[in-house]
Interface confidence: medium
Amino acid sequence: DLQEADLDLLRVTLSSKPQALATPNKEEHGKRKKKGKGLGKKRDPCLRKYKDFCIHGECKYVKELRAPSCICHPGYHGERCHGLSL
């Protein structure tokens, strides 16, 4: 359930440009993950479940954390790349 997703983030510097990696702690609430077609690959949740997760950024799913993250577009920051910088 998206509205129960924890969207607070760990902001890090990815390069010399001011970008942000946003990583929420997202529990899967016991739901079994469906495997995608072919060779047992799992579908990228950023393409479906989290397609609207990042407001001004690109979604990247972190398998180790079982959570989506956001790489913010230049000039934006915040937990969901939601805000124009001060």
Partner: antibody, heavy 116, light 106 residues
Framework: EVQLQQSGPELVKPRASVKISCKAS????????MHWVKQSPEKSLEWIGE????????TYNQKFKAKATLTVDRSSSTAYMQLKSLTSEDSAVYYC?????????WGQGTLVTVSA | QIVLTQSPAIMSASPGEKVTMTCSAS?????MYWYQQKPGSSPRLLIY???NLASGVPVRFSGSGSGTSYSLTISRMEAEDAATYYC?????????FGGGTKLEIK
């Protein structure tokens, strides 16, 4: 269950400083930003700033940059806000709050009264 | 910073009545957020990303809008809905809140 427990009410004299606390429980403290919000009858709700407990990185509302100092103590999962050079305009309820989709978790608030 | 103006400042409604309050932004925002606050309590998140209901919020609440004009609607007023409602934006830093709409029960 996520809980944010704030320190009790404060009665302070003008020009003094005060430090209020917000103890977090029920989640990974280092993984979530803590925000602070001021509520006064005159100005409604005002966002003061945010701190990333993991890095110590802070973003202030320019209006409060000279007034508030945000810190955290990761060992006790506690966030702090110090307010300095207090005047009657600083009398308000101060909240710590944590985001889920927006400000979904709030402390119970700390009433700060500035009076001689 | 973006200024949010809520109207009306105070309103009253009878049980079962439809209630609509508005929030106008001084500049265009991507999304609006709505909170409910009762005396002596902390604000409670009702609506996120303009129209999504926060967990545990009754379905009689709904949000809509875009650009600079947003609204919160209660389809059928209940006594427990008497409270002050605040809109909030964070499309531009610093995040800002509206001045609130106080909703009373008739």
């Amino acid at each position: 269950e996520v809980q944010l427990q704030q320190s009790g009410p404060e009665l302070v004299k003008p020009r003094a400083s005060v430090k209020i606390s917000c103890k977090a429980s029920g989640y990974s403290f280092s993984g979530y930003y803590m925000h602070w919000v001021k509520q006064s009858p005159e100005k409604s709700l005002e966002w003061i700033g945010e701190i990333n407990p993991s890095t110590g990185g802070i973003t202030y509302n320019q209006k409060f940059k000279a007034k508030a100092t945000l810190t955290v103590d990761r060992s006790s999962s506690t966030a702090y806000m110090q307010l300095k050079s207090l005047t009657s305009e600083d009398s308000a309820v101060y909240y710590c709050t944590r985001i889920t989709w927006a400000f979904a978790y709030w402390g119970q608030g700390t009433l700060v009264t500035v009076s001689a | 910073q973006i200024v949010l103006t809520q109207s009306p400042a105070i309103m009253s409604a009878s049980p079962g009545e439809k209630v609509t309050m508005t929030c106008s932004a001084s500049s265009s925002v991507t999304y609006m957020y709505w909170y409910q606050q009762k005396p002596g309590s902390s604000p409670r998140l009702l609506i996120y990303d303009t129209s999504n209901l926060a967990s545990g919020v009754p379905v009689r609440f709904s949000g809509s809008g875009s650009g600079t004009s947003y609204s919160l609607t209660i389809s059928r007023m209940e006594a427990e809905d008497a409270a002050t409602y605040y809109c909030q934006q964070w499309s531009s830093y610093p995040p800002t809140f509206g001045g609130g709409t106080k909703l009373e029960i008739k």
